[in-house]
């Protein structure tokens, strides 16, 4: 009896109600391997999802997200609402990044600005809600009287390592 079922190809199931005949999967279902006793349910790409690949008798549907949403997970198992740059998604919707944090994407969370001083550098360009700070050379790198707005020095030649 087991051998009869193993002969059923993908796209069919082994129907116990009909003496283990191989029956086609019913509408909106599929079997991706042979020898199945039941067909899997097709995924429906509705609501915030849109169809990227239709369900067939041998493979499940694949979904993308509609405009204004982005996929979570490699298989787009969920859709999450987009926010603007400078915002993050909370349970109450999109919220502006708090002072000292930024988000340069439509997804994800606000991240703290880089602390330039930890690397012994100074802030060259202040951070915003949308952009991280830009760290410049360390104060010691600046010649006396040079302002922090001085453009970066050209690349040094070999042998001229900084002091």
């Amino acid at each position: 009896l087991q051998d009869l079922c193993s002969n059923c190809p993908a796209g069919t199931f082994c129907d116990n109600n009909r003496s283990q005949i191989c029956s086609p999967c019913p509408p909106n279902s599929f079997s991706s391997a042979g020898g199945q006793r039941t067909c899997d349910i097709c995924r429906q790409c509705k609501g915030v999802f849109k169809t990227r690949k239709e369900c067939s008798s041998t493979s499940n549907a694949e979904c993308d997200c509609i405009s204004g949403y982005h996929c979570l997970g490699a298989e787009c198992s969920m859709c999450e609402q987009d926010c603007k740059q400078g915002q993050e998604l909370t349970k109450k919707g999109c919220k502006d990044c708090c002072f000292g944090t930024f988000n340069d994407q439509k997804r994800g969370i606000c991240r703290p600005w880089t602390n330039c001083s930890l690397d012994g550098k100074s802030v060259l360009v202040n951070g915003t809600k949308e952009r991280d700070v830009v760290c410049g050379p360390s104060p010691a790198d600046l010649s006396p009287g040079a302002s922090s707005a001085t453009p970066p020095a050209p690349a040094r030649e070999p042998g001229h390592s900084p002091q």
């Epitope: 995924r43 198992s77 999450e80």
Partner: antibody, heavy 119, light 112 residues
Framework: QSLEESGGDLVKPGASLTLTCTAS?????????ICWVRQAPGKGLEWIAC????????TYYASWAKGRFTISKTSSTTVTLQMTSLTAADTATYFC????????????WGQGTLVTVSS | ALVMTQTPASVSAAVGGTVTINCQAS??????LAWYQQKPGQPPKLLIF???DLASGVPSRFKGSGSGTEFTLTISGVQCDDAATYYC??????????????FGGGTEVVVK
Amino acid sequence: QSLEESGGDLVKPGASLTLTCTASGFSFSSNYWICWVRQAPGKGLEWIACIYVGSSGDTYYASWAKGRFTISKTSSTTVTLQMTSLTAADTATYFCARDSSSYYMFNLWGQGTLVTVSS
Amino acid sequence: ALVMTQTPASVSAAVGGTVTINCQASEDIDTYLAWYQQKPGQPPKLLIFYASDLASGVPSRFKGSGSGTEFTLTISGVQCDDAATYYCQGGYYTSSADTRGAFGGGTEVVVK
């Protein structure tokens, strides 16, 4: 293709227990959510939690189960349900089930494993 | 939270008769509804998915209908083997952490 639950036992109130759902004849792929459902003796079915066994690993819980129950994918063929601070109200047969639709429709179920919480 | 209300709790039918079971969702769930049959000592068996699609191997005497909040399972030409408890289940994964899924309370079908 089949699912089999194991780990059910008689435990005392306050104890913890881990149940395992093992797949045979297939491996957990990106198509599937694996979920746990329980049924107290003589009562109806109650959904507990689901995990997406594709790469995203999303997990979702019934509101009453959050914090005390943890669903995890532990291999390509096993999913576990960790339960803590068990009470007599958790006495039930625990089923694991498979969903390919993303809408809580289970076409494949295990036979269930009995958890009894009693002093 | 999504609540599924199933009626009646019990129904009796003669062989060859018709049984109708109703299920009401507390909010619009489109057609994201399944019906299961469960016999004592066994796990549930999927009968209907997406409110009206017949699962593989399920006899055509089982018919599901409805959408939104009102759903019905009809068993025509009832057979002795149909004696069981039937459950509806509605649910969907939302795009946030708020996830909804629920079973109805069940309907026992007695076949005379």
